[in-house]
Protein backbone atom coordinates (compact mmCIF):
# COMPACT_ATOMS: atom_id res chain seq x y z
CA UNK A 1 0.00 0.00 0.00
CA UNK A 2 1.45 3.30 -1.01
CA UNK A 3 1.10 6.83 0.77
CA UNK A 4 -0.84 9.67 -1.00
CA UNK A 5 -1.78 13.04 -0.12
CA UNK A 6 -5.06 14.12 0.68
CA UNK A 7 -6.34 17.95 1.09
CA UNK A 8 -9.49 19.14 2.14
CA UNK A 9 -10.74 22.22 3.89
CA UNK A 10 -10.73 22.06 7.28
CA UNK A 11 -14.16 24.18 7.89
CA UNK A 12 -16.87 24.06 5.88
CA UNK A 13 -20.51 25.73 6.85
CA UNK A 14 -23.69 23.70 5.54
CA UNK A 15 -26.52 25.95 4.26
CA UNK A 16 -29.50 26.35 5.87
CA UNK A 17 -31.33 23.38 3.36
CA UNK A 18 -28.51 21.09 5.05
CA UNK A 19 -26.49 20.88 2.20
CA UNK A 20 -22.78 21.05 2.47
CA UNK A 21 -20.34 21.06 -0.59
CA UNK A 22 -16.08 20.62 0.04
CA UNK A 23 -13.27 19.83 -2.98
CA UNK A 24 -11.13 16.52 -1.94
CA UNK A 25 -7.86 17.06 -3.88
CA UNK A 26 -5.69 14.00 -4.36
CA UNK A 27 -1.78 14.23 -5.37
CA UNK A 28 -1.95 11.81 -7.67
CA UNK A 29 1.07 9.93 -8.98
CA UNK A 30 -0.07 9.36 -12.04
CA UNK A 31 -3.68 8.87 -14.16
CA UNK A 32 -5.64 5.55 -12.03
CA UNK A 33 -7.76 4.30 -14.06
CA UNK A 34 -10.46 3.34 -11.44
CA UNK A 35 -10.39 5.49 -8.31
CA UNK A 36 -12.48 4.61 -5.17
CA UNK A 37 -13.91 8.47 -2.63
CA UNK A 38 -14.92 7.83 0.49
CA UNK A 39 -16.56 9.53 3.05
CA UNK A 40 -16.39 8.93 6.51
CA UNK A 41 -17.54 10.95 9.25
CA UNK A 42 -16.30 10.96 12.89
CA UNK A 43 -17.67 12.44 16.00
CA UNK A 44 -17.01 11.21 19.52
CA UNK A 45 -13.79 9.05 18.54
CA UNK A 46 -16.72 6.81 16.37
CA UNK A 47 -16.08 6.70 12.56
CA UNK A 48 -18.96 5.71 10.36
CA UNK A 49 -19.07 5.81 6.91
CA UNK A 50 -21.18 8.64 5.17
CA UNK A 51 -20.91 7.30 1.45
CA UNK A 52 -18.75 5.96 -1.07
CA UNK A 53 -18.21 6.04 -4.99
CA UNK A 54 -16.18 4.49 -7.56
CA UNK A 55 -15.56 5.89 -10.70
CA UNK A 56 -13.56 5.02 -13.86
CA UNK A 57 -11.40 8.07 -14.60
CA UNK A 58 -13.25 10.45 -17.16
CA UNK A 59 -16.67 9.25 -15.83
CA UNK A 60 -18.70 11.09 -13.41
CA UNK A 61 -18.98 9.86 -9.51
CA UNK A 62 -21.86 7.55 -9.26
CA UNK A 63 -23.12 6.87 -5.35
CA UNK A 64 -25.72 4.60 -4.54
CA UNK A 65 -29.67 5.82 -5.10
CA UNK A 66 -30.66 6.36 -2.08
CA UNK A 67 -26.92 8.18 -1.19
CA UNK A 68 -27.09 11.49 0.54
CA UNK A 69 -23.68 12.53 -1.16
CA UNK A 70 -23.00 13.46 -5.17
CA UNK A 71 -20.12 14.58 -6.59
CA UNK A 72 -18.32 15.32 -9.70
CA UNK A 73 -14.57 14.93 -10.33
CA UNK A 74 -12.32 16.63 -12.95
CA UNK A 75 -8.84 15.66 -12.67
CA UNK A 76 -7.37 14.76 -9.09
CA UNK A 77 -10.31 16.41 -7.80
CA UNK A 78 -13.49 15.69 -6.60
CA UNK A 79 -16.06 17.58 -5.35
CA UNK A 80 -18.14 16.24 -2.94
CA UNK A 81 -21.96 17.23 -1.29
CA UNK A 82 -23.45 16.30 1.49
CA UNK A 83 -27.39 16.76 1.88
CA UNK A 84 -30.14 16.32 4.24
CA UNK A 85 -27.78 17.32 7.00
CA UNK A 86 -29.11 18.89 10.45
CA UNK A 87 -27.34 19.88 13.46
CA UNK A 88 -27.12 16.69 15.12
CA UNK A 89 -24.74 15.94 11.64
CA UNK A 90 -22.58 18.19 13.00
CA UNK A 91 -18.29 16.69 12.90
CA UNK A 92 -15.61 15.92 11.30
CA UNK A 93 -16.05 15.00 7.75
CA UNK A 94 -13.28 12.93 6.21
CA UNK A 95 -12.19 12.01 2.51
CA UNK A 96 -10.29 9.04 1.48
CA UNK A 97 -9.21 8.06 -1.71
CA UNK A 98 -8.13 5.00 -2.96
CA UNK A 99 -6.48 4.17 -6.54
CA UNK A 100 -7.82 0.88 -7.20
CA UNK A 101 -6.29 0.18 -11.03
CA UNK A 102 -4.16 0.19 -12.05
CA UNK A 103 -1.64 -1.15 -9.67
CA UNK A 104 -0.06 -0.59 -6.93
CA UNK A 105 -2.71 0.29 -4.74
CA UNK A 106 -2.56 3.71 -3.37
CA UNK A 107 -4.62 5.29 -0.33
CA UNK A 108 -4.89 8.72 1.18
CA UNK A 109 -6.95 9.74 3.68
CA UNK A 110 -7.34 13.84 4.21
CA UNK A 111 -7.48 15.26 7.52
CA UNK A 112 -11.32 15.90 7.47
CA UNK A 113 -13.30 19.01 6.69
CA UNK A 114 -14.89 20.11 10.38
CA UNK A 115 -18.85 20.33 8.93
CA UNK A 116 -21.15 22.49 11.09
CA UNK A 117 -25.16 22.17 10.59
CA UNK A 118 -27.32 24.33 12.11
CA UNK A 119 -30.91 23.77 11.95
CA UNK A 120 -32.78 26.77 10.61
CA UNK A 121 -34.63 28.89 13.37
CA UNK A 122 -38.90 28.00 12.80
CA UNK A 123 -40.51 30.92 10.65
CA UNK A 124 -42.90 32.75 13.28
CA UNK A 125 -46.45 32.63 13.03
CA UNK A 126 -47.54 35.75 11.07
CA UNK A 127 -50.92 37.75 11.30
CA UNK A 128 -51.26 38.39 7.83
CA UNK B 1 13.49 0.61 -1.88
CA UNK B 2 13.42 0.21 -5.37
CA UNK B 3 16.44 0.55 -7.23
CA UNK B 4 17.13 0.33 -11.24
CA UNK B 5 20.44 -0.33 -13.01
CA UNK B 6 21.09 0.01 -16.75
CA UNK B 7 23.65 -1.97 -18.25
CA UNK B 8 24.57 -3.18 -22.03
CA UNK B 9 27.31 -2.33 -24.35
CA UNK B 10 28.50 1.30 -24.62
CA UNK B 11 29.29 1.21 -28.38
CA UNK B 12 27.07 0.10 -31.14
CA UNK B 13 27.76 0.16 -34.68
CA UNK B 14 25.46 2.53 -37.29
CA UNK B 15 22.63 0.42 -38.39
CA UNK B 16 23.21 -2.01 -35.73
CA UNK B 17 20.56 -3.10 -32.92
CA UNK B 18 21.38 -0.92 -29.27
CA UNK B 19 20.15 -3.76 -26.54
CA UNK B 20 20.34 -2.03 -22.88
CA UNK B 21 19.12 -3.90 -19.70
CA UNK B 22 17.13 -3.04 -16.68
CA UNK B 23 17.48 -4.69 -12.97
CA UNK B 24 15.63 -3.86 -10.95
CA UNK B 25 15.90 -4.62 -6.89
CA UNK B 26 13.36 -4.00 -4.11
CA UNK B 27 10.45 -4.17 -5.97
CA UNK B 28 8.85 -6.91 -8.09
CA UNK B 29 8.01 -5.43 -11.68
CA UNK B 30 5.04 -8.17 -11.95
CA UNK B 31 3.25 -6.13 -8.88
CA UNK B 32 2.85 -3.33 -10.92
CA UNK B 33 4.05 0.35 -11.85
CA UNK B 34 5.08 0.64 -15.70
CA UNK B 35 8.34 0.92 -16.84
CA UNK B 36 10.61 3.19 -18.96
CA UNK B 37 13.47 3.97 -21.12
CA UNK B 38 14.03 7.62 -21.17
CA UNK B 39 17.16 9.08 -23.02
CA UNK B 40 19.61 11.93 -23.08
CA UNK B 41 21.97 13.43 -25.74
CA UNK B 42 25.22 15.05 -24.86
CA UNK B 43 24.17 18.62 -23.87
CA UNK B 44 21.07 18.19 -24.64
CA UNK B 45 17.16 17.39 -22.84
CA UNK B 46 15.12 14.27 -21.53
CA UNK B 47 13.17 12.30 -24.10
CA UNK B 48 11.07 9.77 -23.42
CA UNK B 49 11.38 6.25 -25.35
CA UNK B 50 8.42 4.33 -24.04
CA UNK B 51 7.07 1.94 -21.26
CA UNK B 52 6.29 -1.98 -20.75
CA UNK B 53 4.18 -2.23 -18.08
CA UNK B 54 3.58 -4.37 -15.23
CA UNK B 55 1.15 -6.43 -17.42
CA UNK B 56 3.18 -6.64 -20.27
CA UNK B 57 2.03 -3.93 -21.90
CA UNK B 58 3.51 -1.62 -23.89
CA UNK B 59 4.11 1.84 -25.25
CA UNK B 60 6.12 3.55 -27.48
CA UNK B 61 7.02 7.27 -28.62
CA UNK B 62 5.92 7.60 -31.98
CA UNK B 63 8.99 9.25 -33.07
CA UNK B 64 10.53 6.04 -32.30
CA UNK B 65 7.95 3.64 -32.68
CA UNK B 66 8.85 2.18 -35.51
CA UNK B 67 12.78 1.40 -34.35
CA UNK B 68 11.39 0.32 -30.69
CA UNK B 69 10.58 -3.17 -28.84
CA UNK B 70 10.78 -3.49 -25.37
CA UNK B 71 10.23 -6.74 -23.37
CA UNK B 72 10.25 -7.70 -19.72
CA UNK B 73 11.90 -10.82 -17.70
CA UNK B 74 10.05 -11.49 -14.90
CA UNK B 75 12.13 -14.18 -13.66
CA UNK B 76 15.08 -12.56 -13.79
CA UNK B 77 12.97 -9.00 -12.85
CA UNK B 78 14.62 -6.80 -15.38
CA UNK B 79 13.02 -5.50 -18.76
CA UNK B 80 15.10 -4.13 -22.12
CA UNK B 81 15.45 -2.11 -24.71
CA UNK B 82 15.83 -2.87 -28.56
CA UNK B 83 16.44 -0.07 -30.58
CA UNK B 84 17.31 -0.87 -34.25
CA UNK B 85 18.84 0.74 -37.46
CA UNK B 86 20.94 3.49 -35.13
CA UNK B 87 22.67 6.36 -36.34
CA UNK B 88 24.87 8.99 -34.26
CA UNK B 89 21.91 11.06 -33.03
CA UNK B 90 20.72 7.96 -31.55
CA UNK B 91 24.05 8.55 -29.24
CA UNK B 92 22.80 9.55 -25.74
CA UNK B 93 23.05 8.73 -21.74
CA UNK B 94 19.95 5.86 -21.20
CA UNK B 95 18.51 6.01 -18.10
CA UNK B 96 15.73 3.62 -17.55
CA UNK B 97 12.80 4.70 -14.84
CA UNK B 98 9.47 3.84 -12.91
CA UNK B 99 6.28 5.38 -13.02
CA UNK B 100 2.68 4.94 -12.50
CA UNK B 101 0.63 5.01 -15.25
CA UNK B 102 0.76 8.29 -17.31
CA UNK B 103 2.68 9.58 -14.00
CA UNK B 104 5.90 11.08 -13.06
CA UNK B 105 9.11 9.36 -12.78
CA UNK B 106 10.03 8.42 -9.19
CA UNK B 107 12.63 6.37 -9.31
CA UNK B 108 15.26 6.22 -11.91
CA UNK B 109 18.52 4.49 -12.92
CA UNK B 110 22.08 5.94 -12.63
CA UNK B 111 22.03 5.82 -16.85
CA UNK B 112 23.89 4.13 -18.95
CA UNK B 113 26.38 5.86 -21.91
CA UNK B 114 25.39 4.50 -25.71
CA UNK B 115 28.01 6.01 -28.25
CA UNK B 116 26.72 5.10 -32.01
CA UNK B 117 30.25 5.00 -33.92
CA UNK B 118 32.05 3.18 -36.84
CA UNK C 1 2.46 15.77 -28.91
CA UNK C 2 2.94 18.49 -26.00
CA UNK C 3 5.50 20.56 -26.25
CA UNK C 4 6.77 22.17 -22.98
CA UNK C 5 8.87 25.16 -23.16
CA UNK C 6 10.77 26.44 -20.26
CA UNK C 7 12.20 29.87 -19.66
CA UNK C 8 14.87 31.26 -19.15
CA UNK C 9 16.92 28.80 -20.99
CA UNK C 10 19.79 30.40 -18.38
CA UNK C 11 18.73 31.47 -14.82
CA UNK C 12 21.98 33.42 -13.06
CA UNK C 13 20.85 33.71 -9.53
CA UNK C 14 22.88 34.77 -6.26
CA UNK C 15 23.25 32.30 -2.92
CA UNK C 16 20.42 33.38 -0.91
CA UNK C 17 17.79 34.61 -3.28
CA UNK C 18 14.49 33.59 -4.63
CA UNK C 19 14.39 31.55 -8.15
CA UNK C 20 11.89 31.54 -10.14
CA UNK C 21 11.58 29.21 -13.40
CA UNK C 22 8.91 28.88 -15.80
CA UNK C 23 6.82 26.13 -18.37
CA UNK C 24 4.51 26.65 -20.80
CA UNK C 25 2.47 23.32 -22.35
CA UNK C 26 1.10 23.89 -25.55
CA UNK C 27 -1.79 22.82 -24.27
CA UNK C 28 -4.18 22.04 -21.16
CA UNK C 29 -1.99 19.63 -18.73
CA UNK C 30 -4.03 19.89 -15.63
CA UNK C 31 -1.92 19.91 -12.74
CA UNK C 32 -0.23 16.75 -14.36
CA UNK C 33 3.26 18.28 -14.16
CA UNK C 34 6.84 17.52 -11.91
CA UNK C 35 9.85 19.10 -11.84
CA UNK C 36 13.29 17.72 -12.25
CA UNK C 37 16.77 18.35 -10.74
CA UNK C 38 19.83 17.18 -12.60
CA UNK C 39 23.45 17.80 -11.84
CA UNK C 40 26.38 16.97 -14.16
CA UNK C 41 26.95 13.39 -14.35
CA UNK C 42 23.72 11.80 -12.53
CA UNK C 43 19.87 11.16 -13.07
CA UNK C 44 17.24 13.19 -12.64
CA UNK C 45 15.66 13.41 -9.28
CA UNK C 46 12.40 14.42 -8.81
CA UNK C 47 11.16 17.55 -6.90
CA UNK C 48 7.70 18.55 -7.28
CA UNK C 49 4.66 16.56 -8.71
CA UNK C 50 1.27 16.94 -9.34
CA UNK C 51 2.39 20.59 -9.79
CA UNK C 52 2.55 21.60 -6.26
CA UNK C 53 3.27 18.51 -3.96
CA UNK C 54 7.00 18.18 -2.91
CA UNK C 55 8.22 14.37 -3.31
CA UNK C 56 9.34 12.73 -0.11
CA UNK C 57 12.77 14.18 1.08
CA UNK C 58 12.52 17.69 -0.58
CA UNK C 59 13.21 20.89 1.37
CA UNK C 60 10.28 23.35 1.95
CA UNK C 61 12.01 25.83 -0.18
CA UNK C 62 10.82 24.04 -3.11
CA UNK C 63 7.70 24.49 -4.02
CA UNK C 64 5.89 24.49 -7.38
CA UNK C 65 2.66 26.15 -8.70
CA UNK C 66 0.26 26.56 -11.81
CA UNK C 67 -2.72 24.83 -13.92
CA UNK C 68 -3.58 24.44 -17.55
CA UNK C 69 -0.57 25.63 -19.03
CA UNK C 70 1.26 27.83 -17.11
CA UNK C 71 3.64 26.79 -14.44
CA UNK C 72 6.43 27.88 -11.95
CA UNK C 73 9.20 26.18 -9.63
CA UNK C 74 10.13 28.39 -6.94
CA UNK C 75 13.44 28.13 -4.65
CA UNK C 76 12.91 31.00 -2.04
CA UNK C 77 16.37 31.20 -0.87
CA UNK C 78 19.87 29.46 -2.90
CA UNK C 79 21.34 26.64 -1.24
CA UNK C 80 24.89 26.00 -2.89
CA UNK C 81 23.39 22.46 -3.81
CA UNK C 82 20.49 23.70 -5.76
CA UNK C 83 22.81 25.40 -8.52
CA UNK C 84 22.24 22.56 -11.35
CA UNK C 85 19.79 21.81 -14.27
CA UNK C 86 15.67 22.16 -13.88
CA UNK C 87 13.05 20.36 -15.73
CA UNK C 88 9.91 20.26 -16.11
CA UNK C 89 7.81 17.36 -17.26
CA UNK C 90 4.13 16.54 -18.12
CA UNK C 91 2.27 13.08 -17.51
CA UNK C 92 -1.37 14.53 -18.54
CA UNK C 93 -1.05 12.81 -22.55
CA UNK C 94 1.05 10.29 -24.06
CA UNK C 95 4.07 10.74 -25.04
CA UNK C 96 5.30 11.80 -21.98
CA UNK C 97 7.17 14.88 -22.29
CA UNK C 98 10.01 16.68 -20.94
CA UNK C 99 11.10 20.73 -21.68
CA UNK C 100 14.26 21.66 -22.45
CA UNK C 101 15.84 22.82 -19.27
CA UNK C 102 16.55 25.85 -17.39
CA UNK C 103 20.22 25.72 -16.24
CA UNK C 104 20.32 27.53 -12.57
CA UNK C 105 24.06 29.10 -11.82
CA UNK C 106 25.80 30.61 -9.62
CA UNK C 107 25.84 35.08 -10.40
Known amino acids: CKAMHVAQPAVVLASSRGIASFVCEYASPGKATEVRVTVLRQADSQVTEVCAATYMMGNELTFLDDSICTGTSSGNQVNLTIQGLRAMDTGLYICKVELMYPPPYYLGIGNGTQIYVIDPEPCPDSDF | QVQLQESGPGLVKPSQTLSLTCAVS?????????WNWIRQPPGKGLEWIGY???????YYNPSLKSRVTMSVDTSKNQFSLKLSSVTAVDTAVYYC???????????WGQGTTVTVSS | EIVMTQSPATLSVSPGERATLSCRAS??????VAWYQQKPGQAPRPLIY???YRYSGIPARFSGSGSGTEFTLTISSLQSEDFAVYYC?????????FGQGTKLEIK
Open chain 3, 50 to 52: STS
Open chain 2, 26 to 34: GYSISSGYY
Open chain 3, 89 to 97: HQYDTYPLT
Open chain 2, 52 to 58: IGYDGSN
Open chain 2, 97 to 107: ARNYYSGYFDS
Open chain 3, 27 to 32: QNVGTY
